[in-house]
């Protein structure tokens, strides 16, 4: 990512900017944006960033609100990079099964699962 | 999902079946399957299930190994359902910002972020 700060710091700064500019961002009272119904956020990154794009196009730019959208675009770049790393490395079945076991274990413990 | 058992129980059973059939599954020593480099599993569901498809096509079917792949296909159906729920509901900016804040908060605490 072409940024001088680590992604974790970028996320922290973005949270702060989001708080700062909340009033400006909610100014458009007619705008409606898709919001996921569940909390398995990583499944919804595409929709979240489409929503950010919609919001950006409807927001008066200038000052640090621009910095907010710049940060969000860098976060998107980071996530796109992570998505690329999902399929780049072809490994043996043994490693795949270890990863699948981990994935299912995480589903079992950390995912928000509706019956 | 057309299954009598809750998804959480389905995942538990699948983990057990994966353990049981490990030896059969690793029989193909030349097969290579993409394995994500990181642990942000939800970003990689597409690749994981493509890998499962590859594995299934290379595995001698019969008995409870069929049950394993059936379960995995039900888990995929569940995840696909969750993905559909990412964009179905159009809400006001306020709700979207709440969700975005939660998403960034989760990135900040629960995601595996490399500097």
């Amino acid at each position: 990512i072409p940024t001088e700060i680590p992604t974790s710091a970028l996320v922290k700064e973005t949270l702060a900017l989001l708080s700062t500019h909340r009033t400006l961002l909610i100014a458009n009272e007619t705008l409606r944006i898709p919001v996921p119904v569940h909390k398995n956020h990583q499944l919804c990154t595409e929709e979240i960033f489409q929503g950010i794009g919609t919001l950006e196009s409807q927001t008066v730019q200038g000052g640090t609100v621009e910095r907010l959208f710049k940060n969000l675009s860098l976060i998107k770049k980071y996530i796109d990079g992570q998505k690329k790393k999902c399929g780049e490395e072809r490994r043996r079945v043994n490693q795949f099964l270890d990863y699948l076991q981990e994935f299912l274990g995480v589903m079992n413990t950390a995912w928000i699962i509706e019956s | 999902i057309p299954t009598e058992i809750p998804t959480s129980a389905l995942v538990k059973e699948t983990l057990a079946l994966l353990s049981t059939h490990r030896t059969l599954l690793i029989a193909n020593e030349t097969l290579r399957i993409p394995v994500p480099v990181h642990k942000n599993h939800q970003l990689c569901t597409e690749e994981i299930f493509q890998g499962i498809g590859t594995l299934e096509s290379q595995t001698v079917q019969g008995g409870t190994v069929e049950r394993l792949f059936k379960n995995l296909s039900l888990i995929k159906k569940y995840i696909d359902g969750q993905k559909k729920k990412c964009g179905e509901e159009r809400r006001r900016v306020n709700q979207f910002l709440d969700y975005l804040q939660e998403f960034l908060g989760v990135m900040n605490t629960a995601w595996i972020i490399e500097s």
Partner: antibody, heavy 119, light 107 residues
């Protein structure tokens, strides 16, 4: 910075067990597998196994299966390698090493722990 | 298990020399091979991963090449601090296995 700090040297009698610790700092412990490698005096390197702190899953080199046990304590970001039924051939320096990514190269190594097995 | 055969087992060279170490895997390991340097009494240090990718902070005089079964580590111009033992490691399949090492000594 990212560091793996191992416990001090041990002297054990044949038949005894030894437990070596490897304390991780400077990163999120559960994000990376911890591998264990040993090196007998004047010899090469030998992989013992790995543990995934994310789910406590471990995998062993068949040569050590049944004698080596890999565990983690997430609360202290520490990995452990216990070797039982020690024999003189187990005299070696034991290293822990972090996987950069899943089943990836070892990007950080511990300083090593000398275990001497002698009657 | 995958056998890793390294050659030579030792070599003598002078500062400024170009040094080449080879590693042969008993089966195809794709490019899942790393090169590791170890100095006497010190912990190992990984120099190269995935056959040819230099790790951050490692001098560019080190380079790796190869895929499948045959791999090479090259030091383009040997420096005093490069005298050490070098190991290849395959992390393609379990159990991970190392070459027996190549000791690079001063001529």
């Amino acid at each position: 910075q990212v560091q793996l700090v191992q416990s001090g040297a041990e002297v054990k009698k044949p038949g005894a067990s030894v437990k070596v610790s490897c304390k991780a700092s400077g990163y999120t412990f559960t994000n990376h597998h911890i591998n264990w490698v040993r090196q007998a005096p004047g010899q090469g390197l030998e992989w013992i196994g790995y543990i995934n702190p994310y789910n406590d899953y471990s995998r062993y080199n068949q040569k050590f299966k049944g004698r080596a046990t890999l565990t983690v304590d997430k609360s202290t970001s520490t990995a452990y390698m216990e070797l039982s039924s020690l024999r003189s051939e187990d005299t070696a320096v034991y290293y822990c090493a972090r996987d950069y990514g899943n089943f990836w190269y070892f990007d950080v190594w511990g300083q090593g722990t000398l275990v001497t097995v002698s009657s | 298990d995958i056998q890793m055969t390294q050659s030579p087992s030792s070599l003598s060279a002078s500062v400024g020399d170009r040094v080449t170490i080879t590693c042969k895997a008993s089966q195809d390991i794709n490019s899942y091979l790393s090169w590791i340097q170890q100095k006497p009494g010190k912990a190992p240090k990984t120099l190269i991963h995935r056959a040819d990718r230099l790790i951050d902070g490692v001098p560019s005089r080190f380079s790796g090449s190869g895929s499948g079964q045959d791999f090479t580590l090259t030091i383009s111009s040997l420096q005093p601090e490069d005298f050490a033992t070098y190991y290849c490691l395959q992390y393609d399949d379990f159990p991970y296995t190392f070459g027996q090492g190549t000791k690079v000594e001063i001529k």
